[in-house]
């Protein structure tokens, strides 16, 4: 039986060209983490093997930095980063645990004056 | 550099059984997933089992259920597949195989061949 | 168990001309699907893995595509050596499984 619960940071916002961490945690459960896959929508990211250490996709390399801890780090945030994120644990006896984060990157000079200067 | 030597093919008749070993070196063995991949003469490849690292995770084809073992022993470095109940359409070349992250395979052994005839 | 689906079985070509293969799964894969390609009395050889990824030292004329069902592997310009059969491959649950074969000959 799965007991276990995966907390994440949920919905978060970063400015482009800026760096997020993307967090999970896994609680509540006594399952021996094996491996922890990151996916954005349909793309591998990232693999923390317990055994292997971290994995990084080729294509991501120059901007996906691994750690802290299980998270991830994306750096040089462009627009085209926005959208689902998911951390996938693989547990031993559990199975599977996929945990979400919806990333928003916003244009960081749009973003500061349309909150500050609202046109009548 | 990564070496996977199988033994222990051959031929055995229907009902009977064999066991098939892979001899791994060149890597921590201990850190990886393996696996068996078969491929029956002519045709295509067909995987057969698998063993995480820690042997507690293991899986298997549906064709092979109930009747074969995959286990590994670390401390051997050597990953094993006892196959019970043989059939005909179990003849094939077996390979043994890394799956780094138990995501894709990046080596492979040479191959043993098991046939299964009367 | 998911089913993969690959397109042609089998295709002739020249050497020089660009090459394309197609794998289809039965149900959405994510990135988890590796290209293997394998030459008679030989073991397969890991060409490209999670979809897009190149596996070290092989050459940069192969290439692959997709995510979800739909991923492809191409040849850029095909060289006497690519003659040969290739093999898609999910990963994304077990039993992890293959897609039927291409075999590319001399035309």
């Known amino acids: 039986m799965m007991t276990g619960t995966i907390e994440t940071t949920g919905n978060i916002s970063a400015e482009k060209g800026g760096s997020i961490i993307l967090q999970c945690h896994l609680s509540s459960t006594t399952a021996q983490v094996t491996q922890v896959n990151w996916e954005q929508q349909d793309q591998l990211l990232a693999i923390c093997n317990a055994d292997l250490g971290w994995h990084i996709s080729p294509s991501f390399k120059d901007r996906v930095a691994p750690g802290p801890g299980l998270g991830l780090t994306l750096q040089s945030l462009t627009v085209n980063d926005t959208g689902e994120y998911f951390c996938i644990y693989h547990t031993y006896p559990d199975g599977t645990y996929t945990g979400r984060i919806f990333l928003e990157v916003l244009e960081s000079s749009v973003a500061e004056h349309g909150a500050r200067f609202q046109i009548p | 550099e990564v070496q996977l030597l199988e033994s222990g093919g051959g031929l055995v008749q229907p009902g009977g059984s064999l066991r098939l070993s892979c001899a791994a070196s060149?890597?921590?063995?201990?850190?990886?997933?393996m696996s068996w991949v078969r491929q029956a003469p002519g045709k295509g490849l067909e995987w057969v089992a698998g063993?995480?690292?820690?042997?507690?995770?293991?899986g298997y084809a549906d064709s092979v259920k109930g009747r074969f073992t995959i286990s590994r022993d670390n401390s051997k470095n050597t990953l094993y597949l006892q196959m019970n109940s043989l059939r005909a359409e179990d003849t094939a070349v077996y390979y043994c195989?890394?799956?780094?992250?138990?995501?894709?395979?990046?080596?492979w052994g040479q191959g043993t061949l098991v046939t299964v005839s009367s | 168990d998911i089913q993969m689906t690959q397109s042609p079985s089998s295709l002739s070509a020249s050497v020089g001309d660009r090459v394309t293969i197609t794998c289809r799964a039965s149900?959405?894969?994510?990135?988890?699907l590796n290209w293997y390609q394998q030459k008679p009395g030989k073991a397969p050889k890991l060409l490209i893995y999670?979809?897009?990824s190149l596996q070290s030292g092989v050459p940069s004329r192969f290439s692959g595509s997709g995510s979800g069902t739909d991923f492809t592997l191409t040849i850029s310009s095909l060289q006497p050596e690519d003659f040969a059969t290739y093999y898609c491959?999910?990963?994304?649950?077990?039993?992890?499984?293959f897609g039927g074969g291409t075999k590319v000959e001399i035309k």
């Open positions: 491959q999910q990963s994304y649950s077990t039993p992890l499984t």
């Open positions: 060149g890597f921590t063995f201990s850190s990886y997933t």
């Open positions: 999670a979809a897009s």
């Open positions: 195989a890394r799956v780094p992250y138990s995501v894709w395979i990046d080596y």
């Open positions: 149900q959405s894969i994510s990135s988890y």
């Open positions: 063993i995480w690292s820690d042997s507690g995770n293991k």
